[in-house]
């Protein structure tokens, strides 16, 4: 059957009907409903929200909605023994203590169960010692400290500013440098945009505001105690000592009022350059230790958090496909929040809710999608993408055989300037075509397409007249689907102007001040950006689930493969002598990319010309498209990262949030000049080139004519 036979309405009518049904007012109402109390993972509040969503999705018309639970390792502060940091004098007396909680915003003073700021999965401990300021605690910051400035962090407590990279990478770097503890703080340079007031008068971070967050280095493992397998009742669990990705030193986050008190006394070396200085009225000395008058004072951390196996709950809704019920298009976003979740995640969850309602409305009118759509409300994303990963582990065999695409739906907004899309190259054309059909919500672009405003505000660095689409990294629930299982994935949200707003995330990220009012007053009063994001996410799901031929263009993969091969070759060519000495050649990789390009081109011609009314041929061609992403998976995974299996993309080893291309080769080349055994190091580069070459060639062959 064709799509129109299955649904009794033409596909175009369906898409229009679906988009027209999405309403900004509903998203606003849902957001308000989801943000009145905290929904921390592992709490009754979040379980009740799961049951509410289950009930409402059933009312909206989904065929089935189930709760799936897993028992995973979570981390919480000790309720009777709070975490804090002190400055202690030579007698050991605490002469300054950091705050125990964030002052709650107006109207929320009587709300219980606001978890105080903490770094999830920090071990317990009370280290004391001299402080070293390590800038953003990036790899390059520690290189600067250790190699250029000859400053040793061993035995020291380091203080790092949030921003630029995932906090777990900061902690890993500090551990490797020998630090005994880590203090994370939000510097106004990164979390206070000039000319904007602090919350509640604006969207900036007040001095008492603190960013919560996990500090794991899971590398895609999911629950730290059950890597590779679902954390169900009969799962074998590792001991805590063998758990994946846990930090080994105490970590705690603070706001800039408290940071001021620690940093103002810093002595030792001056900061190396202006890139190390934030906006506080402090010298930004690196240390170690405090300046002259205060040199006998030390810093002491008091961390008493505990990690415990806790039950979490996903909500999984199904809208069965009429023609290909065994092909799954998944729309998923998380439900758990650190506190109120005004942006993260509920601005996304509210959009998912409205998308479900719209699909349900069509279904009640007799329509069904061609393929099955699965909707997911994930739990425990904030604790390491746990809900999505455990569900994918439990359903991996189904997903790798049936998974067409995964669309992520965390925060719908991180600004209100323009669209931001990260996706597989297979989806580029889908996104371009869809955004050309949608109306821009931007001021000054009335009557213009979203594509036009997006292209103007965020142009592609390579192709004029086209918008930027970024690589997928991690730090969100698409990770297991894309990086581990090789299911084509994408995400879209509204973002800030990266040219003028250089701070790292939105200022109130993961703080108590991330409320409904923040969104309604400052980011999107008309909820027009939320509506646009709903149209983009929902439109992508609609097309992926309902197009007769999957809306994937393999030629776009060919283009990026060439670009990535050029890029990694240029990195390697910074060492021409070694390449010559160790006979390192990229010829095979460029040859495989050329083959891929040619085969993709021929496949696209066949795709254009084949008889779409032949169901066997149609299914065959669609399967080749669906399985192309899967073909980039190496079952052995990347070195020391077995759950990152995609050969073309992986989260950067230096910043989980960022995507890296040809990550195996990239990591083999990284800092290669400092390796003690160059022969072995360049041998590993050659091994990684061969893996990449094989993978690209093998992927190309999946697109060849079958017989």
């Amino acid at each position: 059957k064709s799509s129109s036979e299955a649904t009794n309405i033409t596909p175009k009518h369906n898409m229009k009907a679906f988009l027209d049904e999405l309403k900004a007012e509903n998203i606003k109402k849902f957001l308000h409903n989801f943000t009145q109390i905290p929904h921390l993972a592992g709490t009754e509040q979040n379980f009740q929200l799961a049951k509410q969503i289950q009930s409402q999705w059933k009312e909206f018309g989904l065929d089935s909605v189930e709760l799936t639970h897993y028992d995973v390792l979570l981390s919480y502060p000790n309720k009777t023994h709070p975490n804090y940091i002190s400055i202690i004098n030579e007698d050991g007396n605490e002469i300054f203590n950091t705050s125990l909680f964030e002052p709650p915003p107006a109207g929320y003073e009587n709300v219980s169960d606001i978890v105080p700021p903490f770094s999830a999965f920090s071990p317990q401990g009370m280290p004391e010692g001299d402080l070293v300021y390590v800038n953003y605690a990036r790899t390059e910051d520690f290189f600067k400290l250790e190699r250029d400035m000859k400053i040793n962090c061993s035995g020291k407590i380091v203080i790092a500013r949030y921003g630029k990279v995932f906090r777990g990478n900061k902690v890993k770097n500090a551990q490797l440098a020998g630090a005994t503890g880590v203090i994370l703080y939000s510097d106004p340079a990164d979390y206070f945009a000039p000319g904007v007031k602090s919350y509640p008068d604006g969207w900036n971070l007040p001095g008492g505001g603190v960013q919560r967050g996990n500090i794991l280095n899971l590398n895609g493992a999911g629950d730290p105690l059950t890597p590779g397998y679902p954390a169900n009742e009969y799962a074998y669990r590792r001991g805590i000592a063998e758990a994946v990705g846990l930090p080994s030193i105490p970590v705690h986050p603070i706001g800039y009022y408290d940071a001021q008190k620690l940093l103002e006394k810093m002595g030792g070396s001056a900061s190396p350059d202006s890139s190390w200085r934030g906006s506080l009225k402090v010298p930004y000395n690196v240390g170690p230790g405090f300046t002259g008058n205060f040199s006998t004072q030390k810093v002491k951390m008091h961390i008493h958090s505990t990690s415990e196996v806790t039950r979490i709950y996903n909500v999984i809704g199904t809208l069965r496909g009429a023609v290909e019920p065994d092909r799954y298009v998944i729309l998923g976003g998380h439900r758990d929040s650190w506190v109120f979740g005004g942006i993260d995640p509920q601005s996304g969850a509210a959009v998912v809710h409205e998308i479900v309602r719209s699909f349900g409305t069509l279904k009640k009118e007799g329509w069904r999608p061609r393929r099955t759509i699965l909707f997911a409300s994930w739990d425990a994303e904030e604790f390491g993408l746990l809900g999505s990963t455990e569900w994918a582990e439990e359903n991996s065999r189904l997903l790798q055989e049936r998974g067409v695409a995964y669309i992520n739906a965390d925060s719908s907004i991180e600004g209100n300037y323009t669209l931001r899309v990260d996706c597989t190259p297979l989806m580029y054309s889908l996104v371009y075509n869809l955004t050309k059909e949608l109306e821009s919500p931007d001021e000054g672009f009335e009557g213009k397409s979203l594509y036009e405003s997006w292209t103007k505000k965020s142009p592609s660095p390579e192709f004029s007249g086209m918008p930027r689409i970024s690589k997928l990294g991690s730090g969100n629930d698409f990770e297991v689907f894309f990086q581990r299982l090789g299911i084509a994935s994408g995400r879209a949200r509204y973002t800030k102007n990266w040219e003028t707003n250089k701070f790292s995330s939105y200022p109130l990220y993961h703080s108590v001040y991330e409320t409904y009012e923040l969104v309604e007053k400052f980011y999107d009063p008309m909820f027009k950006y939320h509506l646009t994001v709903a149209q983009v996410r929902g439109g992508m799901v609609f097309e992926l689930a309902n197009s007769v031929v999957l809306p994937f263009d393999c030629r776009d993969y060919a283009v990026v493969l060439r670009k990535y091969a050029d890029k990694i070759y240029n990195i390697s060519m910074k060492h021409p002598q070694e390449m010559k000495t160790y006979s390192v050649s990229f010829d095979s990789l460029f040859s495989a990319v050329k083959n891929f390009t040619e085969i993709a081109s021929k496949f696209s011609e066949r795709l254009r010309d084949f008889d779409k009314s032949n169901p066997i041929l149609l299914r065959m061609m669609n399967d080749q498209l669906m399985f192309l992403e899967r073909a980039f998976i190496d079952p052995l995974g990347l070195p020391d990262r077995p759950f990152y299996r995609h050969v073309i993309y992986a989260p950067s080893s230096h910043n989980k949030y960022a995507g890296e291309s040809f990550p195996g080769i990239y990591d083999a080349l990284f800092d290669i000049e400092s390796k003690v055994d160059p022969s072995q190091a360049w041998g590993e580069v050659k091994r990684q080139i061969s893996i990449a070459t094989f993978t690209v060639q093998a992927a190309a062959e999946t697109l060849s004519e079958v017989a």
Partner: antibody, heavy 121, light 107 residues
Framework: QVQLQQSGAELARPGASVKLSCKAS????????ISWVKQRTGQGLEWIGE????????YYNEKFRGKATLTADKSSSAAYMELRSLTSEDSAVYFC??????????????WGQGTSVTVSS | DIQMTQSPSSLSASLGERVSLTCRAS??????LNWLQQQPDGTIKRLIY???SLDSGVPTRFSGSRSGSDYSLTISSLESEDFVDYYC?????????FGGGTKLEIK
């Protein structure tokens, strides 16, 4: 529907022990804990302690530590409270109540019908 | 331990009347307070959780509120089945403690 069915009334001698049961149905037993509450005739309510069957963790009101022992059997979805070294002060109605197993919860939502314990020589 | 002082200990009121029962907490308990109803046969039912959230199936004439350390259960229009015992429960910190109870009697 959620139900907590408690065992029948107990008559015991001073110094003896009794073991009360609370059989749960209508929900996933391991997603919740069971709290126990004491009510003496014409008196108010006192929290004794709680057990979380999934984890096996128990938490007691210090006042009842040594007096009450809480256990649970996941296979039969039942919770138990043993009261030992009984005195007349232990004569009361004892309630079990369901409590969510999580870092934050809303305390006791569903209650058993109560078990009367009479200690008399 | 946190003391919960409930008042009044008994209250006579008429059908259709609006009544309020109060519990005062000796320490900060945030919104971690429930209201329970006990029937003459001993059956206990939760009416309100987290200070002001109504349990499912509980009539909307029941409501909960807070003012500082005082927590109130209000019945907007008394019906015959409401003339029973009521208790507050704080669950902010262990050991969890109950108010002394209010016996609501028909005038």
């Amino acid at each position: 529907q959620v139900q907590l069915q408690q065992s029948g009334a107990e008559l015991a001698r001073p110094g003896a022990s009794v073991k009360l049961s609370c059989k749960a149905s209508g929900y996933t037993f391991t997603s919740y804990g069971i709290s126990w509450v004491k009510q003496r005739t014409g008196q108010g309510l006192e929290w004794i302690g709680e057990i979380f069957p999934r984890r096996g963790n128990t938490y007691y009101n210090e006042k009842f530590r040594g007096k009450a022992t809480l256990t649970a059997d996941k296979s039969s979805s039942a919770a138990y409270m043993e009261l030992r070294s009984l005195t007349s002060e232990d004569s009361a109605v004892y309630f079990c109540a369901r409590v969510f197993d999580g870092y934050y919860n809303y305390a006791m939502d569903y209650w058993g019908q109560g078990t009367s314990v009479t200690v008399s020589s | 331990d946190i003391q919960m002082t409930q008042s009044p200990s008994s209250l006579s009121a008429s059908l259709g009347e609006r009544v309020s029962l109060t519990c005062r907490a000796s320490q900060d308990i945030g919104s971690s307070l429930n209201w329970l109803q006990q029937q003459p046969d001993g059956t206990i039912k939760r009416l309100i959780y987290a200070t002001s959230s109504l349990d499912s199936g509980v009539p909307t004439r029941f409501s909960g509120s807070r003012s500082g350390s005082d927590y109130s259960l209000t019945i907007s229009s008394l019906e015959s089945e409401d003339f029973v015992d009521y208790y507050c429960l704080q669950y902010a910190s262990s050991p969890y403690t109950f108010g002394g109870g209010t016996k609501l009697e028909i005038k």
